[in-house]
């Protein structure tokens, strides 16, 4: 069986301020077991945007219902975009671990650009 890949098909997305951004991500396998997280930026200072395993993220909705056991679509929508949301977003698959899950594979990233509302 081929190793799981995390696919972010869009290199960049342009969204007008106040609109909703859709960031696409799919996994090619259900294995290994473990959650998906979305981050803005890379490295130790990256910002958590959505965590499948924990928490409620009011601005973020998932495109698919992640409670369904065979789901492999981890795309998200971020509402009410502002210029402060610009950046590169990474969809990251974690492998279940003990005590902590371990980062397994990251998508290539999607750059979100925000167009100012026309005055």
């Amino acid at each position: 069986e081929e190793e799981l890949q995390v696919i972010q098909p869009d290199k960049s997305v342009l969204v007008a301020a106040g609109e909703t951004a859709t960031l696409r991500c799919t996994a090619t396998s259900l294995i290994p077991v473990g959650p998906i997280q979305w981050f803005r930026g890379a490295g130790p200072g990256r910002e958590l945007i959505y965590n499948q395993k924990e928490g409620h993220f009011p601005r973020v909705t998932t495109v698919s219902d992640l409670t369904k056991r065979n789901n492999m679509d981890f795309s998200i929508r971020i509402g009410n975009i502002t210029p402060a949301d610009a950046g590169t977003y990474y969809c990251v698959k974690f492998r279940k671990g003990s005590p902590d899950d371990v980062e397994f594979k990251s998508g290539a990233g999607t750059e979100l650009s925000v167009r100012a509302k026309p005055s």
Partner: antibody
Framework: EVQLVESGGGLVQPGRSLKLSCLAS????????MIWVRQAPGKGLEWVAS????????YYADTVKGRFTISRENAKNTLFLHMTSLRSEDTALYYC?????????????WGQGVMVTVSS | DTVLTQSPALAVSLGQRVTISCGAS??????MHWYQQKSGQQPKLLIY???NLEAGVPSRFSGSGSGTDFTLTIDPVEADDIANYYC?????????FGAGTKLELK
């Protein structure tokens, strides 16, 4: 076999405190969010509090906010509910339940419940 | 908060089809779950995320709906199904339950 066993209930006077425990077995406790739900005698189900797998995210019902504290010890497979300033309306059967992964997931296993009676 | 409205009771005959409804005060997308509670027992998950049958639950139970209107269907009803049924949303905090529907025999 998944098991959730609550303990620590009993009769307590208004204004006093009580600490409930829920011992989990048969699954990897640290993978699951945990929830307390209560049911007053003859009434329906009311969510009380929830805690994520690593304790990073905690939520309370408005009716208990500031009085109840949910916590967990993953090393001991145990969930807690520390209840203070108890009121007569807190009288209920308290259930612990587990929730796989994130906020949107359902409560797939429940304990048998422990009775808390607040009365003078 | 998201208020969930259920009819308080339904009288049914064994072998018939019964539909229990749950209305949400605002959209919960598909994050609606159904539980069965028999007298003196803890709740048991039947259906998760509107239409998914939980493992081990008989196929006579089914769920449907999205947004604000949801239904739990039992077809055919058996004696073992006499219980209270609760809907619960997990779209946003706070989690809320419906007041429950009591399934009774005619």
């Amino acid at each position: 076999e998944v098991q959730l066993v609550e303990s620590g209930g009993g009769l307590v006077q208004p204004g006093r405190s009580l600490k409930l425990s829920c011992l989990a077995s048969g699954f990897t406790f640290s993978d699951y969010g945990m929830i307390w739900v209560r049911q007053a005698p003859g009434k329906g189900l009311e969510w009380v509090a929830s805690i994520s797998s690593s304790s990073s995210y905690i939520y309370y019902a408005d009716t208990v906010k500031g009085r109840f504290t949910i916590s967990r010890e993953n090393a001991k497979n145990t969930l807690f509910l520390h209840m203070t300033s108890l009121r007569s309306e807190d009288t209920a059967l308290y259930y612990c339940a587990r929730r796989y992964y994130g906020f949107n997931y359902p409560f797939d296993y429940w304990g048998q419940g422990v009775m808390v009676t607040v009365s003078s | 908060d998201t208020v969930l409205t259920q009819s308080p009771a339904l009288a049914v005959s064994l072998g018939q089809r019964v539909t229990i409804s749950c209305g949400a005060s605002k959209s919960v997308r598909t994050y609606m779950h159904w539980y069965q509670q028999k007298s003196g027992q803890q709740p048991k998950l039947l259906i998760y995320s509107a239409s998914n049958l939980e493992a081990g639950v008989p196929s006579r139970f089914s769920g449907s709906g999205s947004g604000t209107d949801f239904t739990l269907t039992i077809d055919p009803v058996e004696a073992d199904d006499i219980a209270n049924y609760y809907c619960q949303q997990s779209n946003e905090p706070p989690y809320t339950f419906g007041a429950g529907t009591k399934l009774e025999l005619k």
